[in-house]
Structure formats: structure tokens, C-alpha cells
């Protein structure tokens, strides 16, 4: 018996110690979001265990005070979705004593109308403004620095129009140090963790993005007033490019922001000569007037692998050679505006074009190919180590188009016992239908049957291997009862069969000699019990008149026992 797995909050995460009573779930939110509800839930014991509180949610609050602000993020309510109307949100950021703040503009997208973002160099609504969205056409790529330890951020929205709002990153830094750099859609490595003068930082972009503006390497200079010698670069998904990596990503221009209208972009992807390319189109959300074309070669004269417009779900393409050309043309007239409108294409170098791509090993399992070369028709079987079970298809086949018939399976830890099954001549009581660890099954035999084995089985976890029942399923055997002692035949009569002991359930039959009639039951049964006993007293044979004799005979015949019984041959 266990609690259900708690729901992961959007823009947050949950960690669970155990799903059994006493177990706990801890929730936390991504930077910029605040937890609404209980941070910590406990699984309570009951016939059906339950969490002691509702799962919390992560919300972007409208304002707040962030004291001891070291690094973090403030986002407008609803971000990355749209904010609502008639908001006035104030955030106060306060760096630790002796430190100052730097603000990076991750995103600012305000509705045209009267929505406004003001950042003030101080701790209140009347502090001097140092950024005002009304006035500033372009976001300062170098961000903003506080001259003291505070920034006051003010977002106000009017009654019409809405947009994604804002996401601001803040970093506190010490006197004599530079602030922590930031690059959206990228990463950096630093020669020292606190960025004193002399620190160098090297930037790189996430796959699919290109470094633009600024420098790849920047240095913290000027001991009197430490600052970066160059502005941080930006990582942007650009229109067109030549890629010679064995794996990578091609993104629509500006992804995940919307691409522009009237674009004509061409990407060339080139891998090793004796290889080919697998294109995994993971996102394709373009307008009906936009066209994405894949050419099986290194220019636009090559064979068209596929041409697509409008939205389409996940699919894959394979080239026949080591080059592919991707062309994207967006409609000059209309644009599909919206976050994550565009495409995301992952590409991989795969072996030559008479084999399916190499399949990876899977954690906690192994694979067995039917033959070493992954040619058309090859079957690969995946199996899991003890304690794990295959999720998905365990058998994959290399198809005629050199793609695998199924997606890669995975080995999932087995967290329940198999169904121990029904036992003949019994009914069972189960504590939980899927038999998780801790579940019990109780067997109860039908009347007249006795239990051989354990009546209650419990599902136990094991260090190695799958969970196991505490015992084998029992059996319900017919009760072994004492026999009835034989009854003597009545005077002037006979009994059949003539045994000393009669097993429980057996029947004996009585008959009388000619001229005598039976008084009592002609057949009696050995009734099972402790002890077993006869169903009726034995009958007697009484002398009869001639009329009576004949009547009794006809009666005797009319009352003949069933064929299975045996009558005394004296009749």
C-alpha cells in the first residue's frame, strides 16, 4: 500500500524519499518562481495511504522582496506565458552587505500599449530610474549595475493587451570583483569562481546556437573599478550555416522566439564520406505559407528528401549520402508569432546506407543482435538485468528503409510482485491490485478443503532482483475425514457393501428377505465431520401378510436405488 507519485509542479521539481506511509515528498521551484502550498508532504497511513496535503504549484509572483540576493531570477507573473492586465508589481533586490548587483535582461516583451518596466537604482519606488522600457528601444546587452546594494524593479500593465513580460537575472558581486557573466542559450567556464580582477571567462553556445556580438573570451580588468573588458556574447539561432560535426542541432532562426517573415535560410550538414545522416525532426511548427525542404545532397539541385509546411509531429528522415541541405523559406506576408514556433532538427552521423543505425546499450540491460551486421531483417533483442523489466518493445527489427521498427526500450526497476494467481477451491483477498512491495494476498479455502502452505503472502523488496513473495501460493486439499464404522445388516435383511469402515460421503443400502418389509431408510450416508456420522439410524425388516408382501415388493421395486448403487444379490 502506497501513496501515488506526487505531481511535479510546472517550473519546479519534486524529490520523494518513499511512497510508503512515513515517506516524504519535497518540492522546490525554478529560480524566479515561488512555491504556493506545502513545501513538504508526508505519506499518511490509511487503508489507501494518502499525502497529508495537496501538491503545491510554482508561480511567478507579482513582486516581492529578495534580501541577500546572490544569484537568481525574477519573472513576471505567468512567464513564459503572458502576464495579465492591470498589474503593478514591485520587486526589491538587496545584495549582501558590501556587495552590488548586476541585472541581465534575459527577456523583456511588453505589449505596445501602456505596459512598462522601470528599474530604479535604489530601494524604493522614488529611486532614480536607470532603465525605462518607455524610453529604451534596445535592451542594454551589458545589463545594469547598481551603484549601491539595491535595485527596485517596477512592472505595470494596463487594461489592454498582454505579452510574455520579463525575465531578469541578478547576480551580486563583491567590491574588487566583476559580476558573474550570463549567456542565454549557452554556457561559460571561468578561471576562478568569484571573478576577481584577472579572471578570464570563455563562452560556448548550446547546440544549434551561434556566438554573436561580444567576445568568446572576456577578462575582468581594472583593479580600481573592476569590469569585463568586453560585453558578454549572445547565443542566437541564426539563419543558414555550414556544419561539419558528426551530430548536432539545426534550429529555426531566433528559436525559441518566433522566426522572422520573408527569410530564406540554407544549412549544409556534412559528415564523413562513408557515412550518412539521420535527421530527427523533433519540433515542426511553421506556418502554412512557410516551407522547410530537405535535399539529399550538398546543394539545392539534389533529390528532395521531404518538403513540409504547417505543423507536423515528430518524424525522422535518412539521407543516402554524407551531405544534406536544409532550406527554410518563411512567408513574406504573414508570420506565425509565438514562443516556440519554428523547428528543432537533431542530426546524427550513421553508418553507410545498407545498415540500420547502431543501437545503444540500455542502462540495466543488454542487447543481443541476431547477427553482427545490422542489415535489413536483423533483429535485436533487449533484455533486462534481474530486478528490471523491459518497458516498450524488447524486439526491434531493421526495416527495409533502414530504420528500426520500434523506439528504444528501457529497463525499469520492478517495484511490484507478479500476480501469484488463484488457488483452486479457494478465494483470495488482495491489499493492492498491482501487488507493489508491501502488498499482501490472503487465501481462504472453500468449505471441505484444508490449506496446505502459507495463507498470507507478502511482497518483499530484494537488494538484487525483482521483489518476491514471502512464500509459494498454498493449496486447498479435500479434507481427510474419519470413516463411519460399518452397521450390521438388519435381522432378516442384508446391507451392501458389507465393509467394516465406510469413507466420508459413502452410502450403504439395505434390503429385506422375502416376506419382510423395510421400516426406515433404504439408503443412509456417511456424513463428513469430526467425527463422521451416519445420516439416519439403520432400518429394520418386519414380517408382512401376503398382500403386504406383494405390496411391499412392488414398493421395493418402485423405490429401487440409483444405478450407481449395488443391491444385495439376494433380491
Amino acid at each position: 500500500l502506497s501513496c501515488h507519485f506526487p505531481r511535479r509542479p510546472a517550473y519546479g521539481d519534486v524529490t520523494v524519499t518513499s511512497l510508503h506511509p512515513g515517506g516524504s515528498a519535497r518540492f522546490h521551484c525554478a529560480t524566479g518562481y515561488q512555491l504556493k502550498g506545502a513545501r513538504h508532504l508526508t505519506c499518511l497511513n490509511a487503508t489507501q495511504p494518502f499525502w497529508d496535503s495537496k501538491e503545491p504549484v510554482c508561480i511567478a509572483a507579482c513582486g516581492g522582496v529578495i534580501r541577500n540576493a546572490t544569484t537568481g531570477r525574477i519573472v513576471s507573473p505567468g512567464f513564459p506565458g503572458n502576464y495579465s492586465n492591470n498589474l503593478t508589481c514591485h520587486w526589491l533586490l538587496e545584495a549582501p552587505e558590501g556587495q552590488r548587483l548586476h541585472l541581465h535582461f534575459e527577456k523583456v516583451s511588453l505589449a505596445e500599449d501602456d505596459d512598462r518596466l522601470i528599474i530604479r537604482n535604489g530601494d524604493n519606488v522614488e529611486a532614480p530610474p536607470v532603465y525605462d522600457s518607455y524610453e529604451v528601444e534596445y535592451l542594454p546587452i551589458e545589463g545594469l549595475l547598481s551603484s549601491g546594494k539595491h535595485f527596485f524593479v517596477e512592472l505595470s500593465t494596463d487594461s489592454s493587451g498582454a505579452a510574455a513580460g520579463m525575465a531578469l537575472r541578478y547576480e551580486a558581486f563583491q567590491q574588487g570583483h566583476c559580476y558573474e557573466p550570463f549567456v542565454k542559450y549557452g554556457n561559460f567556464s571561468s578561471s576562478t569562481p568569484t571573478y576577481p580582477v584577472g579572471t578570464t571567462v570563455e563562452f560556448s553556445c548550446d547546440p544549434g546556437y551561434t556566438l554573436e556580438q561580444g567576445s568568446i573570451i572576456i577578462e575582468c580588468v581594472d583593479p580600481h573599478d573592476p569590469q569585463w573588458n568586453e560585453t558578454e556574447p549572445a547565443c542566437r539561432a541564426v539563419c543558414s550555416g555550414e556544419i561539419t560535426d558528426s551530430a548536432g542541432v539545426v534550429l529555426s532562426p531566433n528559436w525559441p522566439e518566433p522566426y522572422g517573415r520573408g527569410q530564406d535560410c540554407i544549412w549544409g550538414v556534412h559528415v564523413e564520406e562513408d557515412k550518412r545522416i539521420m535527421l530527427d525532426i523533433r519540433v515542426l511548427r511553421i506556418g502554412p505559407g512557410d516551407v522547410l525542404t530537405f535535399y539529399d545532397g550538398d546543394d539545392l539541385t539534389a533529390r528532395v528528401l521531404g518538403q513540409y509546411s504547417g505543423p507536423r509531429s515528430h518524424f525522422k528522415l535518412f539521407t543516402s549520402m554524407a551531405d544534406v541541405t536544409i532550406q527554410f523559406q518563411s512567408d513574406p506576408g504573414t508570420s506565425v508569432l509565438g514562443y516556440q514556433q519554428g523547428f528543432v532538427i537533431h542530426f546524427f552521423e550513421v553508418p553507410r546506407n545498407d545498415t540500420c543505425p547502431e543501437l545503444p546499450e540500455i542502462p540495466n540491460g543488454w542487447k543481443s543482435p541476431s547477427q553482427p551486421e545490422l542489415v535489413h531483417g536483423t533483429v535485436v533483442t533487449y533484455q533486462c538485468y534481474p530486478g528490471y523489466q523491459v518497458v516498450g518493445s524488447s524486439v526491434l527489427m531493421c526495416q527495409w528503409d533502414l530504420t528500426w521498427s520500434e523506439d528504444l526500450p528501457s529497463c525499469q526497476r520492478v517495484t511490484s510482485c507478479h500476480d501469484p494467481g488463484d488457488v483452486e477451491h479457494s478465494r483470495r483477498l488482495i491489499s493492492s491490485p498491482k501487488f507493489p512491495v508491501g502488498a499482501t494476498v490472503q487465501y481462504i479455502c472453500d468449505q471441505g478443503f484444508v490449506l496446505m502452505g502459507s495463507s498470507i503472502l507478502t511482497c518483499h523488496d530484494r537488494q538484487a532482483g525483482s521483489p518476491k513473495w514471502s512464500d509459494r501460493a498454498p493449496k486447498c486439499l479435500l479434507e481427510q475425514l474419519k470413516p463411519c464404522h460399518g452397521l450390521s445388516a438388519p435381522e432378516n435383511g442384508a446391507r451392501s457393501p458389507e465393509k467394516q469402515l465406510h469413507p466420508a460421503g459413502a452410502t450403504i443400502h439395505f434390503s429385506c428377505a422375502p416376506g419382510y418389509v423395510l421400516k426406515g431408510q433404504a439408503s443412509i450416508k456417511c456424513v463428513p465431520g469430526h467425527p463422521s456420522h451416519w445420516s439416519d439410524p439403520p432400518p429394520i425388516c418386519r414380517a408382512a401378510s401376503l398382500d403386504g408382501f406383494y405390496n411391499s415388493r412392488s414398493l421395493d421395486v418402485a423405490k429401487a436405488p440409483a444405478a450407481s448403487s449395488t443391491l444385495d444379490a439376494a433380491h
Epitope: R100, D114, R116, N121, G122, E126, A127, P128, P129, V130, Y131, D132, Y134, E135, V136, P140, L144, L145, S146, S147, G148, D225
Partner: antibody, heavy 116, light 107 residues
Framework: QVQLQQSGAELARPGASVKMSCKAS????????MHWVKQRPGQGLEWIGY????????KYNQKVKDKATLTADKSSSTAYMQLSSLTSEDSAVYYC?????????WGQGTTLTVSS | DIQMTQSPSSLSASLGERVSLTCRAS??????LSWLQQTPDGTIKRLIY???TLHSGVPKRFSGSRSGSDYSLTISSLESEDFAGYYC?????????FGGGTKLEIK
């Protein structure tokens, strides 16, 4: 386009008071603070203070705190500065400036002459 | 209060010449500095804000830069209408303070 139209030149006696105006147009008056700046003949610029027309909150330079009083009339989008107990030291050109980043738009100035 | 020290106080230059004016802040102003131009008739215009951002409509021959606590205004090639007074203004904290001004005269 943003315009700040200031009232005409003033001549005043020592000890008197004057009230000059600055009429804003081309933007939402309550969306920006209005600052006032003094420039004595042949001298540099000195910040007097500002008013937030939305809340009527005012902030003054401590050096001129008791000299100037800033007010605003939302209905006419006009800011006012009253100078009291005038002395010859108050003879100067007074500018109003919109409180954008680093005072983005300026009025043409009002000349005040204090003379007996 | 933050003191803004502006230099030179006056400067003679010829048409087409490149000139630079400097302001130094007595305290940290984090780049919150604007440059203003005052023409002989008293009109004041903002040229640059945030140390280096050009106000809309201002010719590209004007540029601003920062090096530590020193801020500069550069006019790459002087034109006749550029002969005027120039002031720096810090707007990092109240009270706002101005540099003493530079009078740029034609040689």
C-alpha cells in the same frame, strides 16, 4: 513629439515669491517625473528637485529645500515651481526637464530676475 | 552628494576635428551618466544616456564611452552646430549632479 513649454520671463522684488509653469505635451504627463534645474548667469547647472505628478511625491535638493515648492496639475498636464523669499541669488534661468534616463527632454527655460 | 569633475572647462577646435570631453565621478555611478548639449540660445538637449547610448535623432558623430569612473563624450568630426556648451549629468542617485561644463569654441 515631447514638448515642455515654460512660462515667460519673470521680474520680481527681493522677498517676493514667483510661480512659474511648465506645460507638457506629446506624452502621458503622469508617466514621468518632472525635474527643475537652475542655471545662474555664466554658471553651470544645479538640480533643484522633482515632482511625481501621479502621486504628487516631491524630492528636493537639500541646498534649495526651503526655497522651492513643486506642484503639478494633472488635468492640464502642467508642473509648477514656486520660489519664495527671493534674493538676487535666485536670479537665474530655470529649466523643467522630463525625468527620463538622465533628463531626456528639456523646456526652453524661464528667466527670473530679482531686482529692487 | 556625488561630485562630477568635468574637463576641460573650455576647448577650441576646428571644423572636422575630433574632440573628447571627460567626466569623472567621485563615487560609483555604474554607467548612469548622460551628456547634455546647451546651444548658445540656452536650449538643452540630451545627446547620450547610460554612458554610451545615443538619444534618438542625435547624429552618429557623437559617442560616449566609459573606463572605470571616467566617462567620455567624443565628437568624431566637428560641425558648426556642435560649438556649444556640454554637461555631464549623473542620475545614479539623488541629488542629480552635473559636471561644471565644457565650452566648445570654434578655433
Amino acid at each position: 513629439q515631447v514638448q515642455l513649454q515654460q512660462s515667460g520671463a519673470e521680474l520680481a522684488r527681493p522677498g517676493a515669491s514667483v510661480k512659474m509653469s511648465c506645460k507638457a505635451s506629446g506624452y502621458t504627463f503622469t508617466s514621468y517625473t518632472m525635474h527643475w534645474v537652475k542655471q545662474r548667469p555664466g554658471q553651470g547647472l544645479e538640480w533643484i528637485g522633482y515632482i511625481n505628478p501621479r502621486s504628487d511625491y516631491t524630492k528636493y535638493n537639500q541646498k534649495v529645500k526651503d526655497k522651492a515648492t513643486l506642484t503639478a496639475d494633472k488635468s492640464s498636464s502642467t508642473a509648477y515651481m514656486q520660489l519664495s523669499s527671493l534674493t538676487s541669488e535666485d536670479s537665474a534661468v530655470y529649466y523643467c526637464a522630463r525625468g527620463g534616463l538622465g533628463l531626456d527632454y528639456w523646456g526652453q527655460g524661464t528667466t527670473l530676475t530679482v531686482s529692487s | 552628494d556625488i561630485q562630477m569633475t568635468q574637463s576641460p572647462s573650455s576647448l577650441s577646435a576646428s571644423l572636422g576635428e575630433r574632440v573628447s570631453l571627460t567626466c569623472r565621478a567621485s563615487q560609483e555611478i555604474s554607467g548612469y551618466l548622460s551628456w547634455l548639449q546647451q546651444t548658445p540660445d540656452g536650449t538643452i538637449k540630451r545627446l547620450i544616456y547610460a554612458a554610451s547610448t545615443l538619444h534618438s535623432g542625435v547624429p552618429k558623430r557623437f559617442s560616449g564611452s566609459r573606463s572605470g569612473s571616467d566617462y567620455s563624450l567624443t565628437i568624431s568630426s566637428l560641425e558648426s552646430e556642435d560649438f556649444a556648451g556640454y554637461y555631464c549629468l549623473q542620475y545614479a542617485s539623488y541629488p542629480y549632479t552635473f559636471g561644471g561644463g565644457t565650452k566648445l569654441e570654434i578655433k
